[in-house]
């Protein structure tokens, strides 16, 4: 399986909020015998290996962060302590897995990854990440809501999470 | 702080089963973001990942060792043991249990290890 | 399985000297891979994480690097204190070991 960043780049106004995506795909097995764990942490781009460095999120850390579930399964982080610091991790169906942060301040810019571990039971791991940036603008030229830039040269997108 | 400890026969006899038990403290077993495993290092040798166990049950084994190995897991007990059958002179090591952290992947936890002689 | 090859086996240098050790995975592994300090008589202890991170409480003159493939790690100013044997351990998939190298000093 790998993962992909539906967009590189998002740029945001100061106090929006924003939900940075990454997408699981490929021959992924749904069955009773598979684990996904799927955390969040912020990094720097390195000169060989972008998100080798693991940072925390808002004083949380990857730990904090993570998710797991079959590979049936969707989930999320309901837990008080990550939504006391305004963020929420979550996975769906489809193999999208997020993380919301609200109220966005400067101080959350920077490179985001995701990090997913799938445990096949009797058999294998294997593990992938994805990486993206966030920026947070203030002032007159700071965009009026988010804006996501594919990480294909398709054209921009508006988007701000609930 | 997690501690781990290995206890079991110094001595086995070729053919026999080596049974070794790793009990956990400083921490739960059950917890959903580890694996507890097993690695053994010959005399003067390196080191070899035999195997390791998820904390619902589900195991991995190394593919060379995979028909000879079982561990299992007593959470009640917050312990996991090493079951190695029809073993010879080249199962003689140094047995270790550790903890691996799914999400970060090395073994960062380790039990001081325990040597195991097979001999008549 | 993935096979992980370490050079050199063994290595004889004076305190002060910068030690190098490498390390190849037989196929991509990104960055999973680890480096261990083992004393004689103890277990092993984790030093070095993705390849370049720094375990919490590692000296700094520790260090690592490298992708897929090909991995390097250094020590930059040897101590006696660092005399040991060195193992690398990828974690791309199923755990493998490199065959160790043993430190020296001279």
């Known amino acids: 399986f790998k993962v992909a960043t539906l967009y590189s780049l998002y740029v945001c106004p100061e106090g929006q909020n924003v939900t940075l995506t990454c997408r699981v795909f490929g021959p992924v097995d749904k069955g009773h015998d598979v684990t996904f764990y799927k955390t969040w942490y912020r990094s720097s781009r390195g000169e060989v290996q972008t998100c080798s460095e693991r940072r925390p999120i808002r004083n949380l850390t990857f730990q904090d962060l993570h998710l797991h579930h079959g590979g049936h399964q969707a989930a999320n982080t309901s837990h008080d302590l990550a939504q006391r610091h305004g963020l929420e991790s979550a996975s769906d169906h489809h193999g999208n897995f997020s993380i919301t942060m609200r109220n966005l301040t400067l101080l959350d810019s920077g490179l985001y990854c995701c990090l997913v571990v799938e445990i096949r039971h009797h058999h294998s791991e294997h593990r992938v990440h994805g990486a993206m940036e966030l920026q947070v603008q203030t002032g007159k030229d700071a965009p009026s809501s988010c804006v996501a830039y594919p990480s294909s040269s398709q054209e921009s997108e508006n988007i701000t999470a609930a | 702080q997690l501690q781990l400890q290995e206890s079991g026969p110094g001595l086995v006899k070729p053919s026999e089963t080596l049974s070794l038990t790793c009990i956990v403290s400083?921490?739960?077993?059950?917890?959903?973001?580890?694996?507890w495993g097993w690695i053994r290092q010959p005399p003067g040798k390196g080191l070899e990942w035999i195997g390791s166990?998820?904390?619902?049950?589900?195991?991995h084994y190394n593919p060379s060792l995979k028909s000879r190995v079982t561990i299992p897991v007593d959470t009640s007990k917050n312990q996991f043991s090493l079951k190695l059958s029809s073993v010879t002179a080249a199962d003689s090591a140094v047995y270790y249990c550790?903890?691996?952290?799914?999400?970060?992947?090395?073994?960062?936890?380790w039990g001081q290890g325990t040597l195991v002689t097979v001999s008549s | 399985d993935i096979q992980m090859t370490q050079s050199p086996s063994s290595l004889s240098a004076s305190v002060g000297d910068r030690v190098t050790i490498t390390c190849q995975a037989s196929q991509d592994i990104t960055n999973y891979l680890t480096w261990y300090q083992q004393k004689p008589g103890n277990a092993p202890k984790l030093l070095i994480y993705d390849a370049s991170n720094l375990e919490t409480g590692v000296p700094s003159r520790f260090s690592g690097s490298g992708s897929g493939t090909d991995f390097t790690f250094t020590i930059n100013s040897l101590q006696p204190e660092d005399v040991a044997t060195y193992f690398c351990q990828q974690y791309d998939n199923l755990p493998t070991f490199g065959g160790g190298t043993k430190v020296e000093i001279k």
């Open positions: 400083g921490g739960s077993i059950s917890s959903s973001g580890y694996y």
């Open positions: 550790a903890r691996r952290d799914i999400l970060t992947g090395p073994f960062d936890y």
């Open positions: 166990i998820f904390y619902s049950g589900n195991t």
